[in-house]
């Protein structure tokens, strides 16, 4: 008896992080024996969509003409051949940006930092959020990912870096997100250029602890009260 059908490959073009309103195409590639392709979205009635294969039958296209919140999420695809259904593909996480207003990103005490010293990147959101992402331009993945462990929502998150080396230099942006869907991100913050001067070299960045801060009273929208160290935000290296 033949083994299970090989799992298909699932990917998105132009990528898996899409701005609100932009188009995206999801591709599922199986084998030449495929007769039908099925796309499932986590927490949606299955199947989310079915498509006939495109010639030469080894892949199918699922089109999203305008990205909205409803399309963000985790997808898997399958194909059916004469001997049955394949294994599921590895998951594709389709993320939408632009779900919330852009946070603001600051470098404290300054974006000009001497090698060997410390700097903290501060990401602040307009509304309380429980996830903050720090992205470095031209890095393959989010650099740091802070998420509340207890659903406690914060207006800001700190990303300390110490000691700073030349590796830390570059352009950063941050995003914020709500816990009910980590597939929905804010607009990106304006870019922050971190400039490292000096000759102390250490090839490996070593951020220290992370801190979140609760918002201040209503008449002080963005003058936060005292820091709350380790108040439920957990760091993930990605």
């Amino acid at each position: 008896q033949a083994g299970p059908l090989p799992k298909p490959t699932l990917w998105a073009e132009p990528g898996s992080v899409i701005s609100w309103g932009n188009s995206v195409t999801i591709w599922c590639q199986g084998t030449l024996e495929a007769r039908e392709y099925r796309l499932d979205k986590e927490e949606s009635p299955a199947p989310w969509d079915r498509q006939n294969p495109l010639e030469p039958k080894n892949k199918a296209r699922f089109s999203i003409p305008s990205m909205t919140e409803d399309y963000a999420g985790r997808y898997r695809c399958y194909y059916r051949s004469p001997v049955g259904w394949s294994q599921p593909s590895d998951p594709l996480e389709l993320v939408m940006t632009g779900a919330y207003s852009k946070p603001t990103l600051s470098a404290l005490p300054s974006p000009l930092v001497t090698s060997g010293k410390s700097v903290t990147l501060l990401c602040q959101s307009r509304s309380p959020m429980d996830t903050f992402l720090l992205i470095k331009e031209r890095a393959a993945h989010p650099l740091l990912h802070l998420r509340s462990e207890h659903g406690a929502q914060q207006h800001q998150a700190e990303f300390p870096m110490s000691p700073v080396t030349s590796v830390h230099g570059g352009t950063y942006r941050c995003f914020s997100s709500h816990g009910f869907s980590h597939y929905l991100l804010s607009h990106p913050s304006d870019p922050l250029e971190l400039i490292v001067s000096g000759s102390l070299e250490d090839p490996r960045p070593s951020p220290t602890r992370s801190v979140s801060t609760a918002a201040g009273p209503e008449d002080q929208p963005l003058m936060p009260t005292g820091s709350v160290p380790h108040s439920g935000l957990r760091r993930h290296w990605e």
Epitope: W20, G98, L108, S127, Q220, P221, L222, M223
Partner: antibody
Framework: QVQLVQSGAEVKKPGASVKVSCKAS????????IDWVKQPPGKGLEWIGY????????SYNQKFKGRVTMTVDKSTSTVYMELSSLRSEDTAVYYC??????????WGQGTTVTVSS | DIVMTQSPDSLAVSLGERATINCKSS????????????LAWYQQKPGQAPRLLIY???TRESGVPDRFAGSGSGTDFTLTISSLQAEDVAVYYC?????????FGQGTKLEIK
């Protein structure tokens, strides 16, 4: 592109109420605060308050509290501002504006409300 | 409430010349948490809605010509138009977003001399 389209001009008598609408399009409606700003004829800008469409949270300028109510209809991506017990000083252009980070990056075209007996 | 005071109330400048508008707040708009100034500038042309020019006191909004520049810190801020164009005729407002209620300056009317 982001658009905020407001309802048309209104003429009201003193003591009456007016309800102005602001229909949003071109962005993710729920995730952005919408504020309302008053501009009397030939005068400056005055902040009235905001509503957060995601959860209906509101905050009003103390000066307008008790007379203003902001609501949202997520199904039509529309926010509303109702102002009651109108007086002649309420004659103004009322703007809705999308909040970026407590400042306003997009504005509606304005709705003229005239209060006259 | 934070009071925002602009000067002058009106200003006439020749085409191609520099225009300078000042804005003073009754308390500091500089946040100790992020070292940013919570101040924005808007342009309002006759019969139109305001348009965002500058936020964080000096960050130019996307699409705004680079002849517009914001500066200042704490309580004293300036909007500078380096070379006045005919289309810059408008009323300009500053706005603080350091604390509620959000407040605006009274406006400065900019005309061509």
């Amino acid at each position: 592109q982001v658009q905020l389209v407001q309802s048309g001009a209104e003429v009201k008598k003193p003591g009456a109420s007016v309800k102005v609408s602001c229909k949003a399009s071109g962005y993710s409606f729920s995730g952005f605060y919408i504020d309302w700003v008053k501009q009397p004829p030939g005068k400056g800008l005055e902040w009235i308050g905001y509503i957060f469409p995601s959860n209906g949270e509101t905050s009003y300028n103390q000066k307008f509290k008790g007379r203003v109510t902001m609501t949202v209809d997520k199904s039509t991506s529309t926010v509303y501002m109702e102002l009651s017990s109108l007086r002649s000083e309420d004659t103004a252009v009322y703007y809705c504006a999308r909040q970026a980070f407590y400042y306003f990056d997009y504005w509606g075209q304005g709705t003229t409300v005239t209060v006259s007996s | 409430d934070i009071v925002m005071t602009q000067s002058p109330d009106s200003l006439a400048v020749s085409l191609g010349e520099r225009a300078t508008i000042n804005c003073k707040s009754s308390q500091s708009l500089l946040s100790s948490s992020n070292q940013k100034n919570y101040l924005a500038w808007y342009q309002q042309k006759p019969g139109q809605a305001p348009r965002l020019l500058i936020y964080w006191a000096s960050t130019r909004e996307s699409g705004v010509p680079d002849r517009f520049a914001g500066s200042g810190s704490g309580t004293d801020f300036t909007l500078t138009i380096s070379s006045l164009q005919a289309e810059d005729v408008a009323v300009y407002y500053c706005q603080q977003y350091y604390s509620y209620p959000l407040t605006f300056g009274q406006g400065t009317k900019l005309e061509i001399k």
